[in-house]
C-alpha cells in the first residue's frame, strides 16, 4: 500500500509542514520532544556539574556527572560562628563577644535530598570515565 500510495510519506510531510519550521535549526526541537522522555529514563546528567567543569571549578573534580537526586530542598539560614577577631566579622553590627570568643552571623545553605531520579544509572555508582 505504501509503495502504491506513499501514504506514510505524505502524512509525515503534512505533519512536519504543519510545524512551519523557519530554518533547519528548528527541526531538532521536534526530535527533542520525541526523544527526551526516553533518554531521561536511561540517564540524566547534572547540569551544575557540567557547568562547573566548563568553568574549571575545583569543586567539580570529585563529582559525578550522573544526576542522582532530582528533588531537593534548600534551606537558607543564619548561624552564629566564632571568628579570630572583630576584624573578621561580616559587619561591626553583626559582631559580639562573650569575653572568651568573638562571634558573628554567617549565612548557611542546607541542602536536603528528598527524591532520587528515575533513570537506569541512578544506583549504579559507576565512574564517569
Amino acid at each position: 500500500v505504501e509503495v502504491a500510495t506513499h501514504y506514510l510519506e505524505i502524512i509525515t510531510q503534512l505533519i512536519v509542514e504543519s510545524f512551519h519550521f523557519k530554518n533547519g535549526e528548528d527541526a531538532p526541537d521536534l526530535l527533542k520532544v520525541i526523544t527526551k522522555p526516553f533518554t531521561k529514563l536511561i540517564v540524566q546528567l547534572d547540569k551544575k556539574v557540567i557547568s562547573q567543569i566548563a568553568m574549571n571549578d575545583e569543586k567539580a573534580k570529585n563529582k559525578s556527572l550522573v544526576k542522582i537526586w532530582c528533588k531537593t530542598f534548600t534551606n537558607k539560614t543564619q548561624i552564629n560562628v566564632t571568628v579570630p577577631s572583630t576584624a573578621n566579622c561580616t559587619s561591626p553590627s553583626l559582631c559580639w563577644t562573650d569575653g572568651i570568643q568573638n562571634w558573628t552571623m554567617k549565612n548557611v545553605t542546607y541542602k536536603e535530598n528528598i527524591a532520587k531520579c528515575q533513570h537506569i544509572f541512578v544506583n549504579f555508582h559507576l565512574p564517569d570515565l
Epitope: N80, W96, T97, D98, G99, I100, Q101, N102, W103
Partner: antibody, heavy 124, light 106 residues
C-alpha cells in the same frame, strides 16, 4: 531548673594538686549555648575567674593561672572538674562552679547560675 | 587585662535611701558589664547583665546604666535585704571582676 553542686576535699597540702568536681543537673554540659567554669574567692576578698570549658572540650583559662590549671569534662556523668596543681596557702578559697552563656546563643554573657561553693584550705 | 575599679569600696546607708555604686573600666568595654550581689556565706547572684538589663526575678528597684568605661548600679529605695557586697564584672575581653562595694546599714 539547672543546678550546680561542687564536691571535693576540704583540705589540701601545699605543693599538691587541688581537685574539685561540679555535677550539673537539669541541663547538659554538652550544649553549645553555655560555658561551664570555675571562680574562686579567697576569705574576705574578691572574685576571680579561673577558667571555663565549652562544647567539644575547648578550654579557656585566666592567664594568671593558666600554667597550673586544667579543666576537663565527663559528658557521660554530666560533670566537669578543676585541677589546680602546686598549691600554696594563697590558693585557700571558696571555689564556685558556674554557668555562663556563650555567644552562640546570645549577645551577652554573665555568670547566671552558681553552685553553693566549696571551701578549700591549703595547709600542712 | 581590663581592670574594673568600683567606688566607693564601702558605704553606709539607711532603709529607703537611694544608693548609687559606680564601676570604671580601664578601657572601653561597650555594654559588656554585669552586676552581682553577694550576701555573707552565699554565692553571688546576677542582678544586671549587659549594663542595663534586669535579670529575671530581680526586683525592679535595681537598675544599671552606662556604656564605654563608666557604669552605675542604682538601688532606688533600699530594703533590709539589700545590705550586701556588690561586684561589677566585664565580659568584653577575658572575664574580670571589680574589687567589690560593701553596703552596710547606717
Amino acid at each position: 531548673q539547672v543546678q550546680l553542686q561542687e564536691s571535693g576535699p576540704e583540705l589540701v597540702k601545699p605543693s599538691e594538686t587541688l581537685s574539685i568536681t561540679c555535677t550539673v543537673s537539669g541541663g547538659s554540659i554538652s550544649s553549645r549555648s553555655y560555658y561551664w567554669g570555675w571562680i574562686r574567692q579567697p576569705p574576705g576578698k574578691g572574685l576571680e575567674w579561673i577558667g571555663s570549658i565549652y562544647y567539644g572540650g575547648s578550654t579557656y583559662y585566666n592567664p594568671s593561672l593558666k600554667s597550673r590549671v586544667t579543666i576537663s569534662a565527663d559528658t557521660s556523668k554530666n560533670q566537669f572538674s578543676l585541677k589546680l596543681n602546686s598549691v600554696t596557702a594563697a590558693d585557700t578559697a571558696v571555689f564556685y562552679c558556674v554557668r555562663h552563656p556563650a555567644g552562640y546563643s546570645t549577645r551577652w554573657s554573665a555568670f547566671d547560675i552558681w553552685g553553693q561553693g566549696t571551701m578549700v584550705t591549703v595547709s600542712s | 587585662e581590663i581592670v574594673l575599679t568600683q567606688s566607693p569600696s564601702s558605704l553606709s546607708a539607711s532603709v529607703g535611701d537611694r544608693v548609687t555604686i559606680t564601676c570604671r573600666a580601664s578601657q572601653s568595654i561597650s555594654s559588656y558589664l554585669n552586676w552581682y550581689q553577694q550576701k555573707p556565706g552565699r554565692a553571688p547572684e546576677l542582678l544586671i547583665y549587659a549594663a542595663s538589663s534586669l535579670q529575671s526575678g530581680v526586683p525592679s528597684r535595681f537598675s544599671g546604666s552606662g556604656s564605654g568605661t563608666d557604669f552605675t548600679l542604682t538601688i532606688s529605695s533600699l530594703q533590709p535585704e539589700d545590705f550586701a557586697t556588690y561586684y561589677c564584672q566585664q565580659s568584653f575581653s577575658s572575664l574580670t571582676f571589680g574589687q567589690g562595694t560593701r553596703l552596710e546599714i547606717k
